[in-house]
């Protein structure tokens, strides 16, 4: 006869682990034990259960409730045994020893390797601006036994860097994500895409790339000048600019307070209808967290083109 | 080597309570039960319950129920056993001795007498 | 509960074998184990699960057990071998451990 056996057992940390031992022998044989024992380098062969055929399953007193027979149908000269509810401390060597009649006693060795699947943790860097050089957008770490493997899906340009630390049971894998922080970046998303024997997908944590910046700000309203004439209603000048964090909007005149009736409505200057009073140097400022842009316009109001004793005024804008 | 020490003879009035222990050395002492057997005076032996030293779960049999409790210290390798209630009939040497798997006893102690008298 | 019958005691001249028994209801289907005690001294185990010796016990000593009998057997017995000898199983049903009431071997001269 022969032992069936597994030289590795492998599961995940919680699930139950089934130890095999199966003796193929003569029809005629018998199984009077079987024998468990934890294999250990330090503390030698220590006893973890026993499996009779008289008066079935005792169980070693660590594993107490933490060990028993697969369920039925049993086949008698199956040895095998489930030890619940796997933890780290359980990976090992263990050892099983059939005693059979009348061909004697048979053992074989097996490795229980207990998988911990990592549980991933994103950490953003410190807030990207644009003009940085080389900046950490985000680190990811893991870890898990054996040591995870930790990588970054994304469409942004950028360098990934990693480093583990070995612990007793399990090891750590940080990496980090490197970029030089442009505009183009900003909402972009960055995953960190973490791999384990012990996981059945791959785990994937996804950061929304934030990158400060301000653009230039100007002016729009004054395209076509001949808009711009005394007794005009509506007339706006809209301040364009773009930012993160978005930007707020400011309106003065530069040769003094703004004229009464004009409205500042954010990025807006709102006209009432239009007298040559309103001629004159506009500012817009725009500002957020980041820096502070500025733009200026000169807006010369035309005479009423039905009134031709009036000068015509030409508007212009810098 | 594998050794059971047990703590020194005592002499108990009847309702008294007694607590008798049982260092253990020489083994990993949270992988064997302990089993506790008396043996009055010209007497067989009486089995009378089990602990794990790991869990600390217990075993009594039937006729101890409610009198005796087993305890462990896993810090000192020790393990106790109280039986309450004393009366004359419970005069006897008290063992403590390493269970294997399978419930048959491979290292005893040196045995404890327990004589209540008034 | 479950009961395990020892004769009280058995005489053998030395040399010569004696047979020891210990009876229960389908003591073949338990295993037993039998442990030697002599006075004033704690037992000590000489046969498990029916027919294994630990180590340091001689030969001499044997275990059989079928149907409703168990059987210690002690070869070639010396006068070292007096002693009280105590059957003992464990009892599945009722989760508790079960000895005998023990029987006195004498050797003879």
């Known amino acids: 006869g022969e032992l069936e056996t597994s030289d590795l057992v492998t599961v995940v940390l919680g699930q139950d682990a089934k130890l095999p031992c199966f003796y193929r022998g003569d029809p005629d044989e018998q199984v009077g034990q079987v024998a468990w024992a934890r294999v250990d380098p330090n503390e030698g062969t220590r006893e973890l259960a026993l499996l009779h055929s008289k008066y079935g399953l005792h169980v070693s007193p660590a594993y107490e409730d933490r060990v028993e027979q697969p369920p039925p149908p049993r086949d008698p000269l199956d040895g095998s045994i489930l030890l619940r509810n796997a933890v780290q401390a359980d990976e090992g060597e263990y050892e099983c020893r059939v005693s059979t009649f009348p061909a004697g006693s048979f053992q074989a060795r097996m490795r229980l390797r207990v998988l911990v699947p990592p549980l991933p943790s994103l950490n953003p860097g410190p807030p990207l601006e644009e003009g940085q050089g080389l900046t950490l957008a985000a680190s990811c770490t893991a870890e898990g036994s054996p040591a995870p493997s930790v990588t970054w899906d994304t469409e942004v340009k950028g360098t990934q860097s990693s480093r583990s630390f070995k612990h007793s049971r399990s090891a750590a894998v940080t990496s980090e994500f490197h970029l030089v922080p442009s505009r183009s970046m900003n909402g972009q998303p960055l995953t960190c895409v973490v791999s384990h024997p012990g996981l059945l997908q791959d785990q994937r944590i996804t950061h929304t790339l934030q990158v400060a910046f301000l653009a230039e700000a100007s002016v729009r309203g004054l395209e076509d000048q001949n808009l711009w004439h005394v007794g005009r209603e509506g007339a706006t000048l809209k301040c364009l600019s773009e930012g993160q964090p978005p930007p707020k909007y400011n309106w003065t005149r530069l040769d003094g307070p703004l004229p009464s009736g004009v409205r500042v409505k954010g990025d807006t200057l709102g006209f009432p209808p239009l007298t040559t009073e309103h001629s004159g140097v506009y500012v817009c400022h725009v500002s957020n967290e980041l820096s502070s842009r500025a733009s200026q316009v000169t807006v010369e109001v035309l005479a009423d083109p039905e009134d031709p004793g009036k000068q015509v005024d030409l508007v212009s804008a810098s | 080597q594998v050794q059971l020490v047990q703590s020194g003879a005592e002499v108990k009035k009847p309702g008294a309570s007694v607590k008798v222990s049982c260092k253990a050395s020489?083994?990993?002492?949270?992988?064997?039960?302990m089993h506790w057997v008396r043996q009055a005076p010209g007497q067989g032996l009486e089995w009378m319950g089990i602990?794990?030293?790991?869990?600390?779960?217990?075993t009594y049999a039937q006729k101890f129920q409610g009198r005796v409790t087993m305890t462990r210290d896993t810090s000192t390798s020790t393990v106790y056993m109280e039986l309450s209630s004393l009366r004359s009939e419970d005069t006897a040497v008290y063992y403590c001795?390493?269970?294997?798997?399978?419930?048959?006893?491979?290292?005893w102690g040196q045995g404890t007498l327990v004589t209540v008298s008034s | 509960s479950y009961v395990l019958t020892q004769p009280p005691s058995v005489s053998v001249a030395p040399g010569q074998t004696a047979r020891i028994t210990c009876g229960g209801n389908?003591?073949?289907?338990?295993?037993v184990h039998w442990y030697q005690q002599k006075p004033g001294q704690a037992p000590v185990l000489v046969v498990y699960?029916?027919?294994d010796r630990p180590s340091g016990i001689p030969e001499r000593f044997s275990g059989s057990n079928s149907g409703n009998t168990a059987t210690l057997t002690i070869s070639r017995v010396e006068a070292g071998d007096e002693a009280d000898y105590y059957c003992?199983?464990?009892?599945?049903?009722?989760?508790?451990?079960?000895f005998g009431g023990g029987t006195k071997l004498t050797v003879l001269g």
């Open positions: 699960d029916d027919s």
């Open positions: 003992q199983v464990w009892d599945r049903s009722s989760d508790q451990v079960v």
């Open positions: 020489g083994y990993t002492f949270t992988g064997y039960y």
């Open positions: 389908n003591i073949g289907s338990k295993s």
């Open positions: 001795a390493r269970g294997r798997l399978g419930t048959y006893f491979d290292y």
């Open positions: 602990i794990n030293p790991s869990g600390g779960s217990t």
